[in-house]
Every structure is written in C-alpha cells, then in structure tokens.
C-alpha cells in the first residue's frame, strides 16, 4: 500500500467550538439552497478501496478542490460564515502542503475526479452542495487526519 | 459476515469501575470508528461514546464525560469502555457499534447484542 | 431529555404511508447532513435503515425513505407491514461531536 508522509494535523484545530460551530452553520444555510438531495459528494463512493492510512491524503485533495473551485468563487455567499470559515479551511490546506503519497494514488485520484465530474456537471447547484458538504468534509478531515 | 461481541458487563456498587470489551471480526477493523451505546431498562437509545479509527479522537456524552474513557486495540480487533465513579442511572444494556461505512462512525450500521451493567448498592 | 423531538407514537392500518418527524431543539447547530434512522424490535438490537438523511443500506426495503426540511427530518414508510410495528428512533451527528437521539417513536400497525 502506499505510504502517507506529514498526513496529520493537529487536534487543536478541531477543538474550536466557535469555528466548528460556524462552519456547521455555513453547511446547514447551503444545504438549505440544495434541491438535489440525491446526490452525495462526501461518502461511501468517494471513500470506496481507499484504506483509511490514505485518507488523509484523499481529504486534502477533496478540501483543496473544495476551496479553490468552489468556496472561492462563492466567497460573497452565506455571510457572514463564509469570511471565517473559507481563511481556517485554507489554514488546514496549507497545514496539509507537504501531505504526500508515495506511491501510486491513481485510485485516489479517480475518486476525486469523480467527485469534482459531479460538482462540475451540476454547474451552480454543484457549489452549492459542496458547500453543504461542509460539515462532511470537516469531519471527515477530523476523522481521517488526526 | 460482520460480528460485534460485548462482555464484562456485572453488577456493580455505586462509585465501583467496570471495563466493557467488544470483539469484532468480519471486516478490517481499524477501517472504521467505532460507538458504544446505551439503553436502559425500557427507554430509548443513548449514544455513551465514540472513537476514530486510529483512537486519535475520542469523543464522549456530557452525562459520561470525565468518568468514561474509550479505547481501542487495532492488533486485537478490540474496544474498549472503562467506566468509573459509575452512578444508578448508568445501569443499561450497553451496545458495540460500527459505522455503516468507513469514515462514518456516527452511521450505525452494525450492532452488537449488549451486555448489561447495572449499578446498585 | 433528548436533543432530538420525535412524536411518542403513531399508527397505521396496513398499506397506508406514515410518516415520523424529527426535529431539533431551539438554538441546536443542525447538522442535518448527519440523521440516521433506526429500527429497533423488542429484546433486538437496532437496525439502521436510513443514513446521512436519506440513503438507505443494502437489503433495507425501498418503503422506507427519509427527508429533511429546514431543522426537521423526516422518515417516510409507505405500504405499511404488520412487521413494521417497532420502535423507531432519529439521531444525528452534532457540532461537539456527539451524537444525539430523538427519544424514540412507537409505531403501531393496526
């Protein structure tokens, strides 16, 4: 299996009340805007054949599209959550810069591409679930990365 | 197929400690967070506590907070429930439970029987 | 007292659709994204049958669905069965990271 180096980050960052809070509710007022419930972008499809030493890896992946195709681009959305979520999840992508595979992470990066496939194919309404997704992508770095 | 088995449940005093075990086969199981949950005689259900797959992250009920603590052996595809300072109201039959998928912990989708703690003087 | 309000109980004659509502509690962060509905038959564990709002488990049957709305969530069985008759509790994954159940709803098929 391939090898993970600097996959972690630290329980202290999940260990803010006022930001895991905030980020809940910028997941909850998107997810509110989301007619179509019957997708999902975070869960058993994304994870599928990727072992959890490697999940780490894969949710940067994920929180890095996340930030740069959609939160971005809809930063003027969902205020006032958005101005302080977008900065700690950018935090967390940067504390995951030197997150690494060595080896092959051709599944990985399939399963990803999937995901951003979906995000893109809905247009708009793609983004506007991700956002949603917030909460799942939050505590699917917690899980995977400490 | 995917088992989940409790032990260590007994009687025990007000104040008195316990240690619940739940054996797990079937599947890879440091793949997946695990739970332990609770129901006492003729209510409802109660989540007590729940670990990550590495036990980096354990998180816990208020009502147990501080007097619980959970663990887990990966090597010997176990969990673990150490209870202390244990109080009437934690008499229940306490449940091992596994995520539906990996990743999901709070998904229950495998559960073991229980095994009963009840505490009384 | 549980975080999450579901009715005490419901009823309904065979072939009918009911439908069990779960919802938060003033002022809770809800993190919707997160129910999970469970089946629990006397003297048996529980069972899931619906997860991450409305997606349901391999081998659960396609008459049970789930939805939410604003902070209430929603579980839906259409064509009721003698065997549904259970109890049925809500639970959700919330911003401490605990996880909170309704305190359960007694389903009666007449």
């Known amino acids: 299996a391939p090898i993970s180096s600097h996959c972690r980050l630290d329980k202290s960052n999940f260990q803010q009340p006022y930001i895991t809070n905030r980020t809940f509710m910028l997941a909850k007022e998107a997810s509110l805007a989301d007619n179509n419930t019957d997708v999902r972008l975070i869960g058993e499809k994304l994870f599928h054949g990727v072992s959890m030493s490697e999940r780490c890896y894969l949710m940067k992946q994920v929180l890095n599209f996340t930030l740069e195709e959609v939160l971005f681009p809809q930063s003027d959305r969902f205020q006032p959550y958005m101005q302080e979520v977008v900065p700690f999840l950018a935090r967390l992508s940067n504390r995951l810069s030197t997150c690494h595979i060595e080896g092959d992470d051709l599944h990985i990066q399939r399963n990803v591409q999937k995901l951003k496939d979906t995000v893109k194919k809905l247009g708009e309404s793609g983004e506007i679930k991700a956002i949603g997704e917030l909460d799942l992508l939050f505590m699917s770095l917690r899980n995977a990365c400490i | 197929e995917v088992q989940l088995v409790e032990s260590g449940g007994g009687v025990v005093r007000p104040g008195g400690s316990l240690r619940l075990s739940c054996a797990a086969s079937?599947?890879?199981?440091?793949?997946?967070?695990m739970n332990w949950v609770r129901q006492a005689p003729g209510k409802g259900l109660e989540w007590v506590s729940g670990?990550?797959?590495?036990?980096?992250?354990?998180d816990y009920a208020a009502s147990v907070k501080g007097r619980f603590t959970i663990s887990r052996d990966n090597a010997k595809n176990s969990l673990y429930l150490q209870m202390n300072s244990l109080r009437a109201e934690d008499t229940a039959l306490y449940h091992c439970?596994?995520?539906?998928?990996?990743?999901?912990?709070?998904?229950?989708?495998?559960w073991g029987r229980g095994t009963l703690v009840t505490v009384s003087s | 007292q549980a975080a999450l309000t579901q009715p005490a109980s419901v009823s309904g004659s065979p072939g009918q659709s009911i439908t069990i509502s779960c919802t938060g509690a003033?002022?809770?962060?809800?993190?919707?994204?997160?129910v999970s509905w469970y089946q629990q038959h006397p003297g048996k564990a529980p069972k899931l049958i619906i997860y991450?709002?409305?997606k349901r488990p391999s081998g659960v049957s396609n008459r049970f669905s789930g939805s939410k709305s604003g902070n209430t969530a929603s579980l839906t069985i259409s064509g009721l069965q003698a065997e549904d008759e259970a109890d049925y509790y809500c639970?959700?994954?919330?911003?401490?990271?605990?996880?909170?159940f309704g305190g359960g709803t007694k389903l009666t098929v007449l």
């Open positions: 439970a596994r995520g539906w998928y990996s990743g999901a912990a709070w998904n229950m989708g495998y």
């Open positions: 079937g599947f890879t199981f440091d793949d997946y967070g």
């Open positions: 670990v990550n797959w590495n036990g980096g992250t354990r």
């Open positions: 003033s002022g809770d962060v809800g993190a919707y994204n997160f």
């Open positions: 991450d709002v409305n």
């Open positions: 639970a959700s994954l919330v911003s401490d990271f605990s996880v909170v």
